[in-house]
Structures are given as C-alpha cells and as structure tokens.
C-alpha cells in the first residue's frame, strides 16, 4: 500500500513560521499577511516505526521538492539537515532511520523527536530569523513545541 501523507505547515509555540533560507536550510520568523505565502508546506508521511497513542513516526518532506528533513552526526553532534532524495523512490513506508521523527502530541502541542537520536528535537531559537535545528534540551530557552496547520492538497 502506498504511504499515507498529508500537507501541512508548522509554527512554533511563539507563532514563528518556517521558511526556506538558502537551498538546504530552514529558518523561523514571524510572518503576517501576504508574507505567510513564504512558509514551507510539508508533506508529512506516516511511516513504519514504533507507534503509540501519542507518538507517531513520520517523515517530513518539503511539498513538491525532493527534500526531506534528516538527522545525522556531523562532527560527532546530532544535526538537522535538508537532504535531497530521488523522487522516484520517496516517500516510502520504510524510510531510512535518519528521516524518521516521532511526532509526539502533548496538550495540543506537537514535538518532533528524532528517531535516530532519542531526546533530540526539531527546535527553533527565541530569536527571530534563526535556523531551525536539532536540539538536545526540552523546556529550556529553545522552542521544541509546534502547532500544525492542515493545507489542502
């Protein structure tokens, strides 16, 4: 069976939107009005992995782009990157480990934990216009909570 996907946008708990910053990076900033069209639309795919009521394994692709968020070691540190893939082969039910995030729902907020690096989360900075990154702390200065807005296909 083909992998089930939905289109969505994400905003952090401070209502910052995610936009492209160069070809392989996302940044978070406040957008209003027509600028909202800049925000990236994700194709969230529901993939194979350990699942529970509040934890669902997903892959986050950029809609109509052959780019996926992935988590790899760079200089011995878990790092978030945008990775290009062959569009003929993705998305797929069995995604490579580095592409998988555990979507965790807590109090109507979402966290995205790396399946490859437990306790590392997609994060944004308090400051405006900073890169989206993989952070190893929750509940500190950096933001790990998001809301999801559905986008029609």
């Amino acid at each position: 069976a083909p992998v089930r996907s939905l289109n969505c946008t994400l905003r952090d708990s401070q209502q910052k939107s995610l936009v492209m910053s160069g070809p392989y990076e996302l940044k978070a900033l406040h957008l209003q009005g027509q600028d909202m069209e800049q925000q990236v639309v994700f194709s969230m795919s529901f993939v194979q992995g350990e699942e529970s009521n509040d934890k669902i394994p997903v892959a986050l692709g950029l809609k109509e782009k052959n780019l996926y968020l992935s988590c790899v070691l760079k200089d011995d540190k878990p790092t978030l990157q945008l990775e290009s893939v062959d569009p003929k082969n993705y998305p797929k039910k069995k995604m490579e480990k580095r592409f998988v995030f555990n979507k965790i729902e807590i109090n109507n907020k979402l966290e995205f934990e790396s399946a490859q690096f437990p306790n590392w989360y997609i994060s944004t900075s308090q400051a405006e216009n900073m890169p989206v990154f993989l952070g190893g702390t929750k509940g500190g200065q950096d933001i790990t909570d998001f809301t999801m807005q559905f986008v029609s296909s």
């Epitope: 790899v72 990775e83 062959d86 082969n89 480990k97 580095r98 399946a115 490859q116």
Partner: antibody, heavy 120, light 107 residues
Framework: EVQLVESGGGSVQPGGSLRLSCAAS??????????VGWVRQAPGKGLEWVGH???????SYNPSLKSRFTISRDTSKNTVYLQMNSLRAEDTASYFC????????????WGQGTTVTVSS | EIVMTQSPSTLSASVGDRVIITCRAS??????LSWYQQKPGKAPKLLIY???KLHSGVPSRFSGSGSGAEFTLTISSLQPEDFATYFC?????????FGQGTKLTVK
C-alpha cells in the same frame, strides 16, 4: 574490546532452515544508535547486505531476501539472530555480522563469519 | 536499488605505487560512502567512512574523495600488506549495496 562471534552455520538441504547467532561483547545492543547487520559473501563473490536491526528493534531487510530471512535479538544475551527459511543453493555463503552506529551506516566491527552450505 | 560499480575489477601494482580505485553509484548518494579492505578467509575491515574520513588505526596512505555519484579510494604508496580486495558501500538508501570489489594483486 568489541567482539562479534557468529555461530550456527553448517550444511542444510534445499528448503531447510537454519538460525545463525551473533554474540556481541564490548558494547550493548541497547545503546542508543547501535545497529547490527548481517552481510553475506558467496564463495569467490562480493559482499551482499542481508539485513539489519537497530537498538530499538527496528529492522530492515534486503528486499530480495526479506520473505525468507528474519532478524531478531535477545538484549539479555546481547545476541542477534538471523533466521533463514526455505534455503536455496544460492544462499550458500559466509555470513558475517557487523556493528555500526547510526544511519547512514558504516560497519566498524565485523565477526569472523560462519559458513552456510545449502546442498542436496 | 542503487547499483555500485567499481573499477577496475582487478588491478596489478607494485610496492610503492600510487593506486586509485573508483566507485560509481547509479544515482547521487551524497557523501554516504564507506570503503573496506578484505583479505582471503578474513572479515572485511573498515578503512574510510563518510567518503573521506579515515577510520582510527588506518594508515594515512589511504584516502578517500568524491561526492554525488563518483568516489575514489587512493593508496598513496602501496605496501606489501595492502594487497587485498577492496569494496565500497553506499548508505544513502535501503537496501544498502556494495560494489562488486576490486582485487589488488602483485605485478
């Protein structure tokens, strides 16, 4: 010191089954990011990735083998298993287990291999 | 699946020679490539990972380079213990696939 020791190889008739073991020491299969894969090598041929199991139990297989081969583990024994069913002559090979951390993979440590012969 | 093609399949060289082995992928594999050395009757040994990073304990005469779909393993000055078979492995996409191997023999 990391050690991987395979066992369970031997001769089997076509259609038979065999379970290989890979006993690991010097590291824990449960350590975050840890993976153990199986790689085989037919006599005089190259290397072929068979499948893999991650620290969290997540498995991946070579699609050409998946329906017949299953990887499992026993964390209390720090051992990984390769269950091979419906064996064919072309499964005759040395089977190695190998350790890696994280994806993308590179296999840092290898066992010495165990030989499987499928013949009538 | 991604097909990895090594060239040459066999290579004859002498001690002290500079040797280059090439591995081509059927599609872009980023830098997700590793190299292994195998001697007869033995398990493979990791030489290089992430295309160019030398595994600990591997002599510095071994080096790796490349990106995208074309990669090379270079041995700057061949030593007697380097005569063996060399394999590349791509980790970009499941199933992970090896090159068919390059056998390095004494000229």
């Amino acid at each position: 010191e990391v050690q991987l020791v395979e066992s369970g190889g031997g001769s089997v008739q076509p259609g038979g089954s065999l379970r290989l073991s890979c006993a690991a020491s010097g590291f824990s299969l449960s350590t975050s990011g840890m993976g153990v894969g199986w790689v085989r090598q037919a006599p005089g041929k190259g290397l072929e990735w068979v499948g893999h199991i991650w620290w969290d139990g997540d498995e991946s297989y070579n699609p050409s083998l998946k329906s017949r081969f299953t990887i499992s583990r026993d964390t209390s024994k720090n051992t990984v298993y390769l269950q091979m069913n419906s064996l064919r002559a072309e499964d005759t090979a040395s089977y190695f287990c190998a350790r890696n951390r994280y994806d993308p993979p590179w296999f840092v440590d290898w066992g010495q291999g165990t030989t499987v012969t499928v013949s009538s | 699946e991604i097909v990895m093609t090594q060239s040459p399949s066999t290579l004859s060289a002498s001690v002290g020679d500079r040797v280059i082995i090439t591995c081509r992928a059927s599609q872009d594999i980023s830098n997700y490539l590793s190299w292994y050395q195998q001697k007869p009757g033995k398990a493979p040994k990791l030489l290089i990972y992430y295309t160019s990073k030398l595994h600990s304990g591997v002599p510095s005469r071994f080096s790796g380079s490349g990106s995208g779909a074309e990669f090379t393993l270079t041995i700057s000055s061949l030593q007697p213990e380097d005569f063996a078979t060399y394999f590349c492995l791509q980790g970009k996409m499941l199933p992970w696939t090896f090159g068919q191997g390059t056998k390095l023999t004494v000229k």
